[in-house]
């Protein structure tokens, strides 16, 4: 089991962690489709970590901790995109992440929304090993770009996010 | 048209990993806009979705399954895979691959179906 | 259990019409569009209507879907002794166990 989040650092007792959902307006897009703007929440925060240097033979205690700013609860929800000229495809579902409520969690574990994971292969085919962050894309950074080579209706997809609501 | 056929064992011992492949024909995998599916039905009983894969390899879980499930593709032989770990009696089914059109509630095409019986 | 609230069963004389209903909640059928698959026994699941309430090319008009609130329906006409079958409900949930949903199923008996 993941060792719970630190809230203090007894060397920063001033100091505390903290994790909160940010609204921001995401564009969802898919090639050869009208995107179409929503509005989300990223994941946003300073959760402590820290090293401390070990010892032979090793204390009992941990001496590595990391948390994460990540989605809490989130669910799937389509977003149906509108793609002129596109006969045999008209018109594109995507799913995408919406998210409910962050907090800081574990660095390695799987974030703790009781949605639906997704793992995603690079474009070099099955067997390649998915990134040990459960999510096609990290979790956005107000202002920054999550592109994808290849555009799945079904992945999440960021194309910018604006500032916040 | 496009066309849908399941194929792997049809008796799998209790603990082991149930592997099925769903080969594609009248139609290119990697074609885009649609999903590639795995449903199953227990016997008697009614429908149940297991995933979908995009040919880029992205896959969808259901969660009730997702700690047992690996679903893979392979757009070079045009089919797609399921792995289902440690199975037991509850998961015997007829299990069936489909294809998912560009509206992810629009089962469009299915395969004939593959009865897989779990037992010692 | 289903996601998706279905009758067991309904049974109508031919030529006559049954409905079925499918219920559901806000984060599925409220929210998203509804399709209809039609079992014949033996074989696999067919695409009957999608989109709440629209057919695919060769489905004759018999057969009709609808979308009201959290609940969908079926209707088909003229009933056939062919029509003897399992009717499945299915949508997208995205409740926080999010996922593609079906109804229980119902079998149609032509009496």
């Known amino acids: 089991a993941a060792p719970p989040p630190i809230n203090k650092l007894a060397l920063f007792p001033d100091k505390s962690a903290w994790c909160e959902a940010k609204n921001i307006t995401q564009i969802v897009g898919h090639s050869g489709c009208e995107a179409k703007s929503i509005q989300n929440r990223a994941c946003l925060g300073q959760c402590f970590s820290y090293s401390v240097p070990n010892t032979f033979p090793q204390s009992t205690e941990s001496l590595v901790h990391c948390d994460s700013c990540m989605p809490a609860q989130s669910m799937w929800e389509i977003v149906t995109l509108e793609c002129p000229g596109h006969e045999e495809v008209p018109r594109v579902d995507k799913l995408v992440e919406k998210i409910l409520h962050c907090s800081c969690q574990a660095c390695g574990k799987e974030p703790s929304h009781e949605g639906l994971s997704v793992y995603v292969q690079g474009e070099d085919g099955p067997g390649s090993q998915p990134g040990t962050h459960p999510h096609p894309h990290p979790h956005p950074h107000p202002g920054g770009q999550t592109p994808e080579p290849e555009d799945p209706p079904g992945a999440p997809h960021t194309e910018e996010e604006g500032a916040e609501d | 048209e496009v066309q849908l056929l399941e194929s792997g064992p049809g008796l799998v011992k209790p603990s082991q990993t149930l592997s099925l492949t769903c080969t594609v024909s009248?139609?290119?995998?990697?074609?885009?806009?649609?999903?590639w599916s795995w449903i199953r039905q227990h016997p008697g009983k009614g429908l149940e979705w297991i995933g979908y894969?995009?040919?880029?390899?992205?896959?969808y879980y259901n969660p009730s399954l997702k700690s047992r499930v690996t679903i893979s593709v392979d757009t070079s032989k045009n089919q797609f895979s399921l792995k289902l770990s440690s199975v037991t009696a509850a998961d015997t089914a007829v299990y069936y691959c489909?294809?998912?059109?560009?509206?992810?509630?629009?089962?469009?095409?299915w395969g004939q179906g593959t009865l897989v019986t779990v037992s010692s | 259990q289903s996601v998706l609230t279905q009758p067991p069963s309904v049974s109508a004389a031919p030529g006559q019409k049954v409905t079925i209903s499918c219920s559901g909640s806000s984060s599925n059928i409220g929210n998203n569009y509804v399709s209809w698959y039609q079992q014949l026994p033996g074989t696999a699941p067919k695409l009957l209507t999608y989109?709440?309430?629209k057919r695919p090319s060769g489905i004759p008009d018999r057969f009709s879907g609808s979308k009201s609130g959290t609940s969908a329906t079926l209707g088909i006409t003229g009933l056939q002794t062919g029509d003897e079958a399992d009717y499945y409900c299915?949508?997208?949930?995205?409740?926080?166990?999010?996922?593609?949903?079906f109804g229980g199923g119902t079998k149609v008996t032509v009496l």
């Open positions: 009248g139609g290119s995998i990697s074609s885009g806009g649609y999903y």
């Open positions: 299915g949508t997208w949930d995205s409740s926080l166990s999010a996922g593609h949903v």
């Open positions: 489909a294809r998912t059109n560009s509206r992810i509630t629009m089962i469009a095409d």
């Open positions: 989109d709440n309430n």
């Open positions: 894969i995009y040919y880029s390899g992205s896959t």
